[in-house]
Interface confidence: low
C-alpha cells in the first residue's frame, strides 16, 4: 500500500458572497483507518469545519458519499458564503485511536478568498465612419471584478493587436475593480467583414475568458470607384451609357446623371451586388437621345455616398455618322 498523500489541488479558491464554495481534497490511500476532518486555520485555535465521523454541520455537504468503503474524495461544499468564511482550510486525516483519534497527515491547505467575475466586456467603436488606411480607436470596458489581476487582449480577425493602452482602476485596495482599454486599429479596404475582439481573462473565469466584439462594418466607409462607359450599339435613336459604381460601403448612395451640366436623372441605389469582401457594386444605365444631337455632348455621373462630398466621372459622348444613320436593330 502506498503512503497516504492528502491532495488539496487549489492553493487559492475565489468565491462569491452568497454562493457555494467547493473545497477539494482527495487521498491516495484508504489506510490508515480513521476519519477525515476539515479545519480552518492551524494550531490549537483552529476551527472545526467538518468531521466525517460525527457532529452537525448544516452549511457543509460532502461531494462524495463518505460512507462508501473505497471513497477517496473528501471534498466538501460550504453554502451561503459570507466574508467571515475567508481563511485557509485544511483537510486532515486522523488515525483511529484511543482515547482520541490521532492526527496522521494534513493537506497543504486551500486559501479561500472573495472573488468577483468581470462583467461581459463592452466594445465601443468610433462615432463616425472612417476610410481605409486611417486609424480608428476602439474602447473596451469591464467592471466589478476581484482580485485586481486581470489580462486583456485585443484581436482583429483572430490576429492579436499590440497598439493599445489599458488601465485598471482603482490603483489601491478595493472590493471590485474596473478595466478600460483603448486599441488603435488601421482600417484595410477589406475590413467590412472584419471584427475586433476584446478578450478578458480573470482567475474567477476558470480559464474561459470573456469576449466583447465590434464589427468594423460600423466604423468603415469604403468610397466607391466610378467608371462611365458608352455602349457600342445604338438602340433606335438612343445610345446606352452606364455608370459602374464599384466597391463601396455602406449601401447608402445617390446618383445623378447630367447632360452638358443639366441634371436629367436622379437615382437611389437599389438591387446592389455584394462582393466577397462585403462591399457593394451598382450599375446605372442612362439612355441618350442622339437623333438631333451635336457631337460635343458631355455626360456626368455624380455619386453622393453615405452623405459625403459627391464624386463624379465625365464622358464625352462619341456619336459617329454611322451611329446617327444606322440603328442597331436595322436590317442590312
Amino acid at each position: 500500500e502506498e503512503e497516504l498523500q492528502m491532495i488539496q489541488p487549489e492553493k487559492l479558491l475565489l468565491v462569491t458572497v452568497g454562493k457555494t464554495a467547493t473545497l477539494h481534497c482527495t487521498v491516495t490511500s484508504l489506510l490508515p483507518v480513521g476519519p477525515v476532518l476539515w479545519f480552518r486555520g492551524v494550531g490549537p485555535g483552529r476551527e472545526l469545519i467538518y468531521n466525517q465521523k460525527e457532529g452537525h454541520f448544516p452549511r457543509v455537504t460532502t461531494v462524495s458519499d463518505l460512507t462508501k468503503r473505497n471513497n477517496m474524495d473528501f471534498s466538501i461544499r460550504i453554502s451561503s458564503i459570507t466574508p467571515a468564511d475567508v481563511g485557509t482550510y485544511y483537510c486532515v486525516k486522523f488515525r483511529k485511536g484511543s482515547p482520541d483519534d490521532v492526527e496522521f497527515k494534513s493537506g497543504p491547505g486551500t486559501e479561500m478568498a472573495l472573488g468577483a467575475k468581470p462583467s461581459a466586456p463592452v466594445v465601443l467603436g468610433p462615432a463616425a465612419r472612417t476610410t481605409p488606411e486611417h486609424t480608428v480607436s476602439f474602447t473596451c470596458e469591464s467592471h466589478g471584478f476581484s482580485p485586481r489581476d486581470i489580462t486583456l487582449k485585443w484581436f482583429k480577425n483572430g490576429n492579436e493587436l499590440s497598439d493599445f493602452q489599458t488601465n485598471v482602476d482603482p490603483t489601491g485596495q478595493s472590493v471590485a475593480y474596473s478595466i478600460r482599454s483603448t486599441a488603435r486599429v488601421v482600417l484595410d479596404p477589406w475590413d467590412v467583414r472584419s471584427q475586433v475582439i476584446c478578450e478578458v481573462a480573470h482567475v474567477t473565469l476558470q480559464g474561459d475568458p470573456l469576449r466583447g466584439t465590434a464589427n468594423l462594418s460600423e466604423a468603415i466607409r469604403v468610397p466607391p470607384t466610378l467608371e462611365v462607359t458608352q455602349q457600342p450599339m445604338r438602340v433606335g435613336n438612343q445610345v446606352n451609357v452606364t455608370c459602374q459604381v464599384r466597391k463601396f460601403y455602406p449601401q447608402s448612395l445617390q446618383l445623378t446623371w447630367s447632360e452638358n451640366g443639366n441634371v436629367c436623372q436622379r437615382e437611389t441605389a437599389s438591387t446592389l451586388t455584394e462582393n466577397k469582401d462585403g462591399t457593394y457594386n451598382w450599375t446605372s444605365w442612362f439612355l441618350v437621345n442622339i437623333s438631333d444631337q451635336r457631337d460635343d455632348v458631355v455626360l456626368t455621373c455624380q455619386v453622393k455616398h453615405d452623405g459625403q462630398l459627391a464624386v463624379s466621372k465625365r464622358l464625352a459622348l462619341e456619336v459617329t455618322v454611322h451611329q446617327k444613320d444606322q440603328s442597331s436593330d436595322a436590317t442590312p
Epitope: E1, D65, T67, K68, R69, N70, N71
Partner: antibody, heavy 118, light 107 residues
Framework: EVQLVESGGGLVQPGGSLRLSCAAS????????MHWVRQAPGKGLEWVSA???????YYTGSVKGRFTISRENAKNSLYLQMNSLRAADTAVYYC????????????WGQGTMVTVSS | DIQMTQSPSSLSASVGDRVTITCRAS??????AAWFQQKPGKAPKSLIY???SLHSGVPSKFSGSGSGTDFTLTISSLQPEDFATYYC?????????FGQGTKLEIK
C-alpha cells in the same frame, strides 16, 4: 451494454491447473475493483479473490498461494490462474464487478464450471 | 473473518405475502451489507447495497434496512418470480463473506 463473460472452465485432475478468463464489455475494467466468486454444487456463494484499481490483490484463505488474479487492460479482461487444484475447488466461478465507490457487487457474469476430479 | 448468519435457512410463503429475511454479522460492518437473489441454474442478481440502496432496475417491493450487525431484507408482496434463494453479504473488509442463503419456496 455492460456485460461480463467467463470462459476457461472444464474438467481437470487434482493437482492440475486452469486459467479462467472474464471478458468485459460496455465499461473499462481497470476502473473498477473486480472479483471472482464461486459456488460449489448445491452450496452457497463464496468470495474467492479481488483485484483493486491500483492492482492490489486479495484472496480467501483456502486459495492463497495457489490462485492468482490478474487483468489485462488492453484486452479489458480479468483472469484467475488456478494451480494445485483440489476437489474442493469444484464450483461454478463467477466474475463480478465491484461498484465505483463502495465496491458493492453490481454486475455478475453467467459463470463457468470447473470440475476437479480424477 | 466476519461471519454472516442468515435466518431462516428456508421459508415457505404464498403469493401476496410480505416476507422478511434477517442477517447478522459477527462484528459491526457499518452499513456495508448487500443482498442477492439467485434462481436455480442462474447467476446471482444484485438487489441491495449499503444495507438499503436498491440497484438500478430492482423493483421497489424489495427493501433493506439495518446497520452495525443486524440487517433485514423485506419483500412486500411476493410474486411467483420472487421464489428463489437469497444471500446476504458483508463487504466492509476482506475476505468478503456471504450468508449461507435463505431458500424462499411457494407454500
Amino acid at each position: 451494454e455492460v456485460q461480463l463473460v467467463e470462459s476457461g472452465g472444464g474438467l481437470v485432475q487434482p493437482g492440475g491447473s486452469l486459467r479462467l478468463s472474464c471478458a468485459a464489455s460496455g465499461f473499462t475494467l481497470s476502473s473498477y475493483d473486480m472479483h471472482w466468486v464461486r459456488q460449489a454444487p448445491g452450496k452457497g456463494l463464496e468470495w474467492v479473490s479481488a483485484i483493486g484499481t491500483a492492482g492490489d490483490t486479495y484472496y480467501t484463505g483456502s486459495v492463497k498461494g495457489r490462485f492468482t488474479i490478474s487483468r489485462e487492460n488492453a484486452k479489458n479482461s480479468l483472469y484467475l490462474q488456478m494451480n494445485s487444484l483440489r476437489a474442493a475447488d469444484t464450483a461454478v466461478y463467477y466474475c463480478v464487478r465491484g461498484g465505483v465507490w463502495d465496491d458493492a457487487f453490481d454486475i455478475w457474469g453467467q459463470g463457468t464450471m470447473v470440475t476437479v476430479s480424477s | 473473518d466476519i461471519q454472516m448468519t442468515q435466518s431462516p435457512s428456508s421459508l415457505s410463503a404464498s403469493v401476496g405475502d410480505r416476507v422478511t429475511i434477517t442477517c447478522r454479522a459477527s462484528q459491526g460492518i457499518n452499513n456495508y451489507a448487500a443482498w442477492f437473489q439467485q434462481k436455480p441454474g442462474k447467476a446471482p442478481k444484485s438487489l441491495i447495497y449499503t444495507a438499503s440502496s436498491l440497484h438500478s432496475g430492482v423493483p421497489s417491493k424489495f427493501s433493506g434496512s439495518g446497520s452495525g450487525t443486524d440487517f433485514t431484507l423485506t419483500i412486500s408482496s411476493l410474486q411467483p418470480e420472487d421464489f428463489a434463494t437469497y444471500y446476504c453479504q458483508q463487504y466492509v473488509s476482506y475476505p468478503y463473506t456471504f450468508g449461507q442463503g435463505t431458500k424462499l419456496e411457494i407454500k
